[in-house]
Structure formats: structure tokens, C-alpha cells
Interface confidence: low
């Protein structure tokens, strides 16, 4: 499994990995205590024919080509968790590890 | 988790799983033995404000709103194999578990 | 083998619009991005944009963005290339080219396939 | 917009001899260089990408060097072919920009 890593000079228009930073403050999430920020990063561009396509299936329904169906598009396909220290809905501290908050991979599907 | 199944008559526009059953022999892929067919779903629908958001992420990239970001997509979020009897590319036949070919989750990512 | 085929040479007035085609052929055509590039008489290359035929989506250079629309017709494998308001220093030849990706990461690819080019003379 | 200098605008040379074309870049564009051959009346065709890398089919004579924003074609030993305008291509940031190009004639 492969992506491509852009950034905001890029010229790439297929689906890249772009950089981005959370900024909890930023929202208003003051529940959340550390970190105040971290390296979300995102998913953007066109999935072209076959490109990326992180599984057989994606190409069969392009090749099928039911009613409705939009085409691939760009998502994470491959993503990691977080250490964060936060209030729960009960005012009680918690530190867990909060999965799928980070995009290290982007794909076709 | 959970995810919305449809059919050709249903009047959901969110994101939902159709089902799809791919003829191979229609697509002229004569080096698959077995099956010829097989119920592979495919997933199609507006992914609305946090409607099945699989990941957090996603609704925090909704917040940050870079440039480029196209808001989630209606995308599998989980999928099974099949096993399948073809011929690889040297003549041999093969008799294999292929990986991620049955949806069996829509999901907005 | 791939090959773009574009229309005929074309005489306009200025203010006029013309719309050149490239007919493609031997590749999937929605694959693909197809680029537009001008060169005047006896001058230099300039990039006028590109359109991907699988939706149409299409990036501009700012100097025509305001006179330009690339379109695509899927079912005949052509992309077209209209240019709105013409002036006599849009007289030129106007080629269509295949972008070609050869990796896997940003900016890796390379124009493979030409068109034979388009004369397009603006005069009164 | 990206600036691409190129150098020199024009350039005599005999059948035999080897010559470089260079290219300047207004602002690091990684390796993001593509060179082509242009011909009186023909399309332009694609002779390196990626600075350095040869597209399929193009004689080894034919070959590209730099990165960031310094890049150069060499031929080398020049064919009667060999004869023609040649351009630099920055594909790193749209707008994409062409160098001016250089002519190559026959001395």
C-alpha cells in the first residue's frame, strides 16, 4: 500500500495526503486538556481510474457502473490513534488512547 | 457501528449499501474460474453533518475546513473476502482468499 | 497505439469564439488528464490548463480564466477547448497533451502523447 | 507565477559535439523538470522527466541534471536530428511555466 503526500503548493490533483493541524482550543473543545494540538491531516484530490484504488471491489463497481454510484473517492485508508488526556461527559479525567485521529494514508475506495 | 442498507427502491438519499452483484463473465474477465458471480454490494449517498461518521477525524477536518477538504464521502467501512479459483499470470490455477471484495458497511470518511 | 487527433485550422474575426476538438484514441480516455498548451508564431510554449474527462473537473491559468471553458464528451473520447472574446495575439497554434503519471508522488508525470496542433489565426 | 529562465536563447553547434542547455527556476521546484525537443511545424516531444529521467524511446545522448532550482540538458554528440528548439517545463505549481526555450542550429 502506497499514498502520495502533498501539500499546499502542490499541483497534484489526484487524491493526496495533505497536512493539517487540529487546534482543540481553536473550536472551543476545552474539554480536551492535552494536547491542545496535534497533526490531523487530510485526505483531497480525484480518484482517476484505478488510481490508488486501495481494493479490487472499487474497480468492479467502476466497471459495473450501478445507478447511483459516485465513483471512488479520496478517504483515509490507512489511519493511527492519538494519547489524549480529556474530560468525560462525568467531569473525570481520562487519558486514552483515541483511535483514527491521525491520516497517515490516503487512498481510493 | 452501524450502516443503512437500501435497495433500487428506496427513497434514502444518505449514505446507504446497495446491493451489486458482479458478473464477470460481463466483463470479459475469463482468467476467474469461480465464481462467475457474486454479491459484491457498493455504496452510494449524501454523507450529511456527522451522519455515520466512522472516525472522529473526520468531523474534526469538517471543522477546520482547509482548503481543498470536500467533506466526508459515502465510502465502505468494513468488507469481507471471497474465495475465489483463477488463473494467475502464469497459467496456474489459484485457489484464494481475496481480501475486501464484499461491502458489508457503508460509511461517511 | 495512443494518438489525439485535433480539428482543423481556423480563421476568426476578433470578438469571435472558437472550439477546438482532440478526438482520443488507443488509451481509456476518462483516465486521464488532457492538458492544453499554446505556442504563437514564433514564439515559446504557455499552459492554458487542463480538464480530467472522468468528471470534468478542470484547472485554469488565471490569464484565461475568464475567456476559457475546457469540456470533455466522454462518449466520443474528445475534449474540446473553446476560447471566448478572441484578440489577435491569440492567433497560434493550440495542442492538446496526454499527462502521463509514471510514480507516486506529487507532480509525477510527464506529457506523453501530442496533438498535432490547431492554427487558430485571429485577424480582421 | 513560477519564473523558468533558460539558457542560452540560441546556440550553434556542429554535428559531433556535445552541448548543454541550462535552466533557472524562480523559486525551488523540487525536481519537477520536464525537457522537450521541439521541431519546425511539429508538436513538441518529451525528452526527460523529472530532471533526470529519460522518457521511453529517447536516445541515452540525451540527459538532464539538477534540483531545486538549477537544471541542465546535455546532448551529447549532436545529430543532424539533433537540430532544433528545445524547452524546459516546471510542473511542480500551477500555473505550469515554460522556459523561453533555445534554439539549436547548425553552425
Known amino acids: 500500500d502506497f499514498g502520495l503526500d502533498c501539500d499546499e503548493h502542490s499541483t497534484e490533483s489526484r487524491c493526496c495526503r495533505y497536512p493539517l493541524t487540529v487546534d482543540f482550543e481553536a473550536f472551543g473543545w476545552d474539554w480536551i486538556i492535552a494536547p491542545k494540538r496535534y497533526k490531523a491531516n487530510y485526505c483531497s484530490g480525484e480518484c482517476e481510474f484505478v488510481f490508488l484504488q486501495k481494493y479490487p471491489h472499487t474497480h468492479l463497481v467502476h466497471q459495473a457502473n450501478p445507478r447511483g454510484s459516485a465513483g471512488p473517492c479520496c478517504t483515509p485508508t490507512k489511519m493511527s490513534p492519538i494519547n489524549m488526556l480529556y474530560f468525560n461527559g462525568k467531569e473525570q479525567i481520562i487519558y486514552g488512547k483515541i483511535p483514527a485521529m491521525v491520516v497517515d494514508r490516503c487512498g481510493c475506495s | 457501528d452501524f450502516g443503512l442498507d437500501c435497495d433500487e427502491h428506496s427513497t434514502e438519499s444518505r449514505c446507504c449499501r446497495y446491493p451489486l452483484t458482479v458478473d464477470f463473465e460481463a466483463f470479459g474477465w475469463d482468467w476467474i474460474i469461480a465464481p462467475k458471480r457474486y454479491k459484491a454490494n457498493y455504496c452510494s449517498g449524501e454523507c450529511e453533518f456527522v451522519f455515520l461518521q466512522k472516525y472522529p477525524h473526520t468531523h474534526l477536518v469538517h471543522q477546520a475546513n482547509p482548503r481543498g477538504s470536500a467533506g466526508p464521502c459515502c465510502t465502505p467501512t468494513k468488507m469481507s473476502p471471497i474465495n475465489m479459483l483463477y488463473f494467475n499470470g502464469k497459467e496456474q490455477i489459484i485457489y484464494g482468499k481475496i481480501p475486501a471484495m464484499v461491502v458489508d458497511r457503508c460509511g461517511c470518511s | 497505439q495512443v494518438q489525439l487527433v485535433q480539428s482543423g485550422a481556423e480563421v476568426k474575426k476578433p470578438g469571435a469564439s472558437v472550439k477546438v476538438s482532440c478526438k482520443a484514441s488507443g488509451y481509456t480516455f476518462t483516465g486521464y488528464f488532457m492538458h492544453w498548451v499554446r505556442q504563437a508564431p514564433g514564439q515559446g510554449l504557455e499552459w492554458m490548463g487542463n480538464?480530467?474527462?472522468?468528471?470534468?473537473?478542470?484547472n485554469y491559468n488565471q490569464r484565461f480564466k475568464a475567456r476559457v471553458t475546457m469540456t470533455t464528451d466522454t462518449s466520443t473520447s474528445t475534449a474540446y477547448m473553446e476560447l471566448r472574446s478572441l484578440r489577435s495575439d491569440d492567433t497560434a497554434v493550440y495542442y492538446c497533451?496526454?499527462?502521463?503519471?509514471?510514480?507516486?508522488?506529487?507532480?509525477?508525470?510527464?506529457?506523453?502523447?501530442w496533438g498535432q496542433g490547431t492554427l487558430v489565426t485571429v485577424s480582421s | 507565477d513560477i519564473q523558468m529562465t533558460q539558457s542560452p536563447s540560441s546556440l550553434s553547434a556542429s554535428v559531433g559535439d556535445r552541448v548543454t542547455i541550462t535552466c533557472k527556476a524562480s523559486q525551488d521546484i523540487n525536481s519537477y523538470l520536464s525537457w522537450f525537443q521541439q521541431k519546425p511545424g511539429k508538436a513538441p516531444k518529451s525528452l526527460i522527466y523529472r530532471a533526470n529521467r529519460l522518457v521511453d524511446g529517447v536516445p541515452s545522448k540525451f540527459s538532464g541534471s539538477g534540483s531545486g532550482t538549477d537544471f541542465t540538458l546535455t546532448i551529447s554528440s549532436l545529430q543532424p536530428e539533433d537540430f532544433a528548439t528545445y524547452y524546459c517545463?516546471?510542473?511542480?505549481?500551477?500555473?505550469?511555466?515554460f522556459g523561453a526555450g533555445t534554439k539549436l542550429e547548425i553552425k
Open positions: 517545463l516546471q510542473c511542480d505549481e500551477f500555473p505550469l511555466t
Open positions: 497533451a496526454r499527462r502521463y503519471y509514471y510514480g507516486t508522488g506529487p507532480a509525477d508525470w510527464y506529457f506523453d502523447v
Open positions: 480538464i480530467y474527462p472522468y468528471n470534468g473537473v478542470s
